[in-house]
């Protein structure tokens, strides 16, 4: 499929101008190429009329031109003093003309309307209102005003003075008489439907003098804005119907077959399945403006997009409308990545999340789609070391492994962590890309103990039990603040006995935290990588009290107590159920938070991406 | 939960200069942003000033730009409000705020947040 994208249809009227702008991926090769505009004749061949070369034709002489924006990567062919004779079906391309790299688009000029003396010409767009003046003279003060339209060579009664409403018109026409002092009546008609456009004569009196005055009705179908954006990107419809609708539901719907347009999302609370996670609509303003994004481009999303006001929430005749022709450009410059992520409850799961590789220094975020109301994305996690408080010692987000790709990790997972996550940066370059994490039947692959309580001024040693399957990555132990995770030392204590069926490859790693202090209470992290791709972690509180008795603390043996979370293994190794914990004062002494902001330094973790479309929290 | 604690109000000229702090205590890791409120005798609370914790951005209310500037200094939890060139229509009680939930809507990448933490407020008073 050519990506080349322009307008399908443009139409004009004799004597005006119009300008057609036609969008390219601005790749370098595609900005500096030629750049064309070419008529297509009847046996297939396409007629160069003007191009970025300098070439003009002669039936283009003096009132066309084409221009170039490789910065935007589109261009723009004018035409002027428009005849019968420009319409036709032409291409605008790049390269050589019978190469493909082009978009076919159809020009219409209609001859001008054929007007009789004194007609004012009223342009109104669809779904808007007109008031057409009618003025009279004194003698036809007292007598019945009326609006007439002509149908073929008949004139059809509208609506007049006595009270009669043609029924095509009921609801939404209403005939006002100026005060005293002003010689003139006006027709208002709101809700313009396509089928109002046409011929009307006002009328002060039925005799032979009456005062009469011709109109000329125009009801334009708004000309759709083009849009051209990434496959995986995200595109933002911006809809500002005015304040008279700034009470009725709006939506934005896409226009299937014929004239059916079926609704994307609504004020009403109504949202296509097949955006489910990937759309927002914002609350609206009180002029009636509103807008939606809408991340993830699918190829299938292409196509004609409207926004309106309607009390039902959808399409109807007379409704105000914007236009949109949306293509998907599939030579996108976004990478793919996993839309689907998988992790067990009680396991952990690690995002990547592309960005524009320039803009290395831009915030990164993460956030929850919530689809409640129209949609919110409430920010769990970002960059510059903020997560979310519910979020504390099981989320991270680190800039590894660069290079155009940051990672997210969260564990302690929950079904409740099941849903839409946006990738984000504040960067120009407006990348959002959407990942559904889903959690699935299964047990964790790395074990550790619950929460353990560290004694002041003694030694900690605290186990992690990696499956076989993790022989061959780099093990690891970190302490969690809210900038990352940090490296510390561990040691690997030989084969683990916490796996069934596992070969001496399972391996058991500890942390040792030697003469704990205060400082060492908070969140540890032990996983897996394979160098800045991070796989499984799992989380263990560490919670310090004062000294009770002497001796060291090695928390790998099961205890008879054990909780009721907790099942005992044959190993001897008690399995925890990591439940996600809101706060660690349910363990520990209240205690003031600090702030771990500037701790910025240090080890910061990543994941195998698994399938192109799919990632599993664990890593296979 | 986040607590705030204002100081630094007081009585001052007009054209005079005051600094008001807010030491912040608790989950201040989930603190998104700060902000200072008002409140004048029988009116609305209304906004004056707001940072991001991590200083990169700050908005101010028309009436307070260019004489009143918002800052933060992270090692000790606190942000100020520098109030220069003082009115007797700045005189009302200035609040503290923290948020904590910022989010998404369409007019990303603009960041939202709603102030859902408040200290008690301290008195600032401005003679003619």
């Known amino acids: 499929k050519s990506p080349i994208f322009g307008p399908e249809e443009v139409n004009s009227v004799e004597g005006n101008s119009v300008s057609i702008t036609c969008y390219y991926p601005p790749t370098s090769v595609n900005r500096h190429t030629r750049k064309y505009w070419c008529r297509q004749g009847a046996r297939g061949g396409c007629i160069t009329l003007i191009s970025s070369e300098g070439y003009v034709s002669s039936k283009y002489a003096g009132r066309a031109n084409l221009t170039n924006f490789p910065e935007n990567g589109t261009f723009v062919v004018n035409i002027a003093q428009l005849s019968q004779d420009d319409s036709g079906r032409y291409k605008c391309g790049l390269g050589i003309n019978s190469r493909g790299l082009s978009f076919d688009v159809s020009l219409e000029v209609s001859q001008g309307p054929g007007l009789l003396n004194d007609t004012k010409v009223y342009t109104v767009d669809l779904g808007r209102t007109v008031t057409i003046n009618c003025p009279f003279k004194t003698e036809n003060a007292q007598k019945r005003k009326s609006l007439y339209k002509q149908i073929g060579l008949y004139p059809v009664l509208v609506i007049d003075s006595s009270g009669y409403v043609n029924p095509n018109y009921t609801g939404r026409i209403r005939l006002d008489i100026q005060g005293t002092g002003q010689l003139l009546f006006s027709v208002v008609i709101n809700q313009l439907r396509l089928s109002d456009a046409g011929q009307y004569l006002c009328q002060a009196g039925d005799d032979s003098n009456s005062n009469k005055k011709n109109a000329d009705l125009q009801v334009l179908k708004p000309e759709p804005e083009l849009v051209y954006e990434d496959l995986r990107g995200s595109v933002t419809f911006h809809c500002a119907l005015g304040p008279e609708v700034a009470n009725v539901a709006k939506f934005l719907c896409r226009q299937s077959s014929g004239e059916n347009c079926d609704v994307v999302v609504n004020t009403l609370g109504k949202r296509a399945p097949a955006f489910e996670g990937r759309i927002l609509l914002n609350p609206q303003d009180k002029d009636g403006s509103f807008s939606v994004v809408i991340t993830g481009l699918r190829k299938e999303d292409a196509g004609r997009y409207l926004c309106g006001a309607h009390s039902d929430g959808q399409l109807q005749e007379g409704s105000p409308i914007q236009a949109w022709q949306l293509f998907v450009n599939e030579e996108s410059t976004i990478p793919r990545s996993p839309t689907v992520v998988k992790g067990v409850a009680g396991g952990s799961v690690a995002v990547l999340c592309p960005y524009n590789r320039k803009e290395s220094k831009s915030i990164k975020y993460w956030c929850l789609w919530e689809g409640a109301q129209n949609g919110r994305c409430p920010l769990l996690v970002d960059s510059e070391g903020w997560v979310k408080a519910q979020y504390e010692g099981r989320l991270s987000l680190l800039e590894e492994p660069g290079n155009g790709t940051f990672t997210v990790i969260l564990n302690q997972l929950t079904s409740r962590d099941a849903g839409f996550y946006w990738c984000l940066t504040n960067g120009d370059t407006l990348w959002r890309t959407t990942v559904e994490i889903k959690i699935i039947e299964g047990e964790p692959n790395l074990k550790v103990p619950g929460n353990v309580t560290a004694v002041l001024g003694e030694t900690l040693k605290v186990p992690c039990h990696f499956p076989c399957k993790f022989s061959s990555y780099e093990k690891y132990w970190c302490k969690w603040n809210n900038t990352g995770c940090q490296a510390l030392p561990s040691q690997d204590e030989g084969p683990s006995k916490a796996f069934v069926n596992c070969d001496e490859n399972s391996r058991l790693v500890s942390l040792t935290l030697n003469l704990v202090t205060r400082a060492d209470e908070g969140w540890y992290w032990c996983g897996v990588k394979q160098g800045h791709f991070y796989g499984e972690t799992a989380a263990v509180y560490v919670a310090v009290e004062e000294r009770k008795a002497a001796g060291s603390r090695d928390v790998s043996l099961a205890k008879a107590d054990a909780a009721p979370d907790e099942k005992v293994l044959d190993s001897g190794f008690r399995e925890i159920e990591n439940k996600a914990i809101q706060d660690p004062r349910l363990f520990a002494e209240e205690k003031a938070v600090a702030d771990t902001r500037d701790q910025a330094d240090g080890s910061r973790a990543s994941v195998d991406s698994g399938s192109s479309e799919e990632q599993g929290g664990s890593s296979r | 939960q986040v607590q705030l604690v204002e100081s630094g109000g007081g009585l001052v000229q007009a054209g005079g200069s005051l600094r008001l702090s807010c030491a912040a205590s608790?989950?201040?890791?989930?603190?998104?942003?700060m902000g200072w409120f008002r409140q004048a005798p029988g009116k609305e609370r209304q906004f004056v000033a707001a940072i991001t914790w991590s200083g990169g951005s700050t908005s101010y209310a028309d009436s307070v730009k260019g004489r009143f500037t918002i800052s933060r200094d992270n090692a000790k939890n606190t942000v100020y409000l520098q109030m220069n060139i003082l009115k007797p229509e700045d005189t009302a009680v200035y609040y503290c705020?923290?948020?904590?939930?910022?989010?998404?809507?369409?007019?990303?990448?603009?960041?939202?947040?709603?102030?859902?933490?408040w200290g008690q407020g301290t008195l600032v008073t401005v003679s003619s």
């Open positions: 608790g989950r201040t890791f989930s603190v998104y942003a």
């Open positions: 705020a923290a948020a904590t939930n910022p989010y998404f809507s369409d007019y990303y990448p603009d960041l939202k947040y709603e102030f859902d933490y």
